[in-house]
């Protein structure tokens, strides 16, 4: 039986979760983030094969997001535009995961510090992403049944020299459904 991923100690070391990232903001947008076959990223009202995502910890508090169906990594340009890439560029495709008190998560580009915003449905990946919702509710997907794609970066150990070696300090200490088994 797999160890549930609710422990903050499992936030690093290659921990893998399958999730749908759902968002509902004040502008009547309700959508699941999906990474499409052509590399575009958008929102779908319903859960779909393209919206099932694999979230894998790279180091404390930092994850990569992989579209399970399309085998594309979620990445972000310096202007905030999202795209799905076949190649994992750690500087474009690594996101800091911040847990909020209400169960939602916020994701920020580790390199640029920009929050992950869901682009409009018709926004091509090469256009700057319009401002969309930045809070995502990670909904459990199916447990990983297929062997995971080869890791690009070896998981890094906790930064023992840091005052926050496990990246525990964030907007809150609240437990997110992202870590529900």
């Amino acid at each position: 039986h797999p160890i549930p991923d609710s422990s903050p100690l499992l936030q690093f070391g290659g921990q893998v979760r399958q999730r749908y990232l759902y968002t509902d903001d004040a502008q009547q947008t309700e959508a699941h983030l999906e990474i499409r076959e052509d590399g575009t990223v958008g929102g779908a009202a319903d859960q779909s094969p393209e919206s099932l995502l694999q979230l894998k910890a790279l180091k404390p508090g930092v994850i990569q997001i992989l579209g399970v169906k399309t085998s594309r990594f979620l990445c972000q340009r310096p202007d905030g535009a999202l795209y799905g890439s076949l190649h994992f560029d750690p500087e474009a495709c690594s996101f800091r995961e911040l847990l909020l008190e209400d169960g939602y998560n916020v994701y920020q580009s580790e390199a640029h510090g920009l929050p992950l915003h869901l682009p409009g449905n018709k926004s091509p990946h090469r256009d700057p992403a319009p401002r969309g919702p930045a809070r995502f509710l990670p909904l459990p997907g199916l447990p990983p049944a297929l062997p995971e794609p080869p890791g690009i970066l070896a998981p890094q150990p906790p930064d023992v020299g840091s005052s926050d070696p496990l990246s525990m300090v964030g907007p809150s200490q609240g437990r997110s459904p992202s870590y529900a088994s």
């Epitope: 085998s71 076949l86 560029d89 750690p90 500087e91 990946h125 690009i152």
Partner: antibody
Framework: EVKLVESGGDLVKPGGSLKLSCAAS????????MSWVRQTPDKRLEWVAT????????YYPDSVKGRFTISRDNAKNTLYLQMSSLRSEDTAMYYC????????????WGTGTTVTVSS | QIVLTQSPAIMSAPLGERVTMTCTAS???????LHWYQQKPGSSPKVWIY???NLASGVPTRFSGSGSGTSYSLTISSMEAEDAATYYC???????????FGGGTKLEIK
């Protein structure tokens, strides 16, 4: 217009060093992975080096690992290739190439610069 | 490391003829990772077909690409003079990241 222009190619003796530059224009340089690809005199294409968008991650084939170093200056929109311990088999036309954002094939190529290694 | 072998190395075809060239991988390659480039003498390579079947911008519709696993091909439905060039297949491997080219097929007019 999206453009890549290489420079720095020269005739150099075996064991020597050379630094190539590639000036990029017409696109947001810092958004793209970049590579060097060379074409040998027999017209074969060989991937030489790749660098991530921010420059922190680099990749090389075994044939140049430890001898070549790829780097970039996003503020100057310039890509570099430092070559050392050059061998005769490094003689080639060197192209700077941009990676497509989503599929990572080489979607834009420069005009190339010639490196000849000979005594 | 995957090796890409292109055949034939050189071929000639009369104008109007259907042309097919192949690219064989030493082990299976995802169709998303297989691309083709065209190069004419004195010019840099240009992406011609990406992800096995998708024509790059400006590529005539007489070109097509197909394949899966270890066998891929580029086809010209009706050879035209401007198609005379060398075509290279190219593969991306995800982990560790590497990029490999085939030896090329030189297409001439008969």
């Amino acid at each position: 217009e999206v453009k890549l222009v290489e420079s720095g190619g020269d005739l150099v003796k075996p064991g020597g060093s050379l630094k190539l530059s590639c000036a990029a224009s017409g696109f947001t340089f810092s958004s793209y992975g970049m590579s060097w690809v060379r074409q040998t005199p027999d017209k074969r294409l060989e991937w030489v080096a790749t660098i991530s968008t921010g420059g922190g991650y680099t990749y090389y084939p075994d044939s140049v690992k430890g001898r070549f170093t790829i780097s970039r200056d996003n503020a100057k929109n310039t890509l570099y290739l430092q070559m050392s311990s050059l061998r005769s088999e490094d003689t080639a036309m060197y192209y700077c190439a941009r990676h497509d954002l989503v599929d990572w094939y080489f979607d834009v190529w420069g005009t190339g610069t010639t490196v000849t290694v000979s005594s | 490391q995957i090796v890409l072998t292109q055949s034939p190395a050189i071929m000639s075809a009369p104008l109007g003829e259907r042309v097919t060239m192949t690219c064989t991988a030493s082990s299976s390659v995802s169709s998303s990772y297989l691309h083709w480039y065209q190069q004419k003498p004195g010019s840099s390579p240009k992406v011609w077909i990406y992800r096995t079947t998708n024509l790059a911008s400006g590529v005539p519709t007489r070109f097509s690409g197909s394949g899966s696993g270890t066998s891929y091909s580029l086809t010209i439905s009706s050879m035209e003079a401007e198609d005379a060039a060398t075509y290279y297949c190219h593969q991306y491997h995800r982990s560790p990241p590497t990029w490999t080219f085939g030896g090329g097929t030189k297409l001439e007019i008969k």
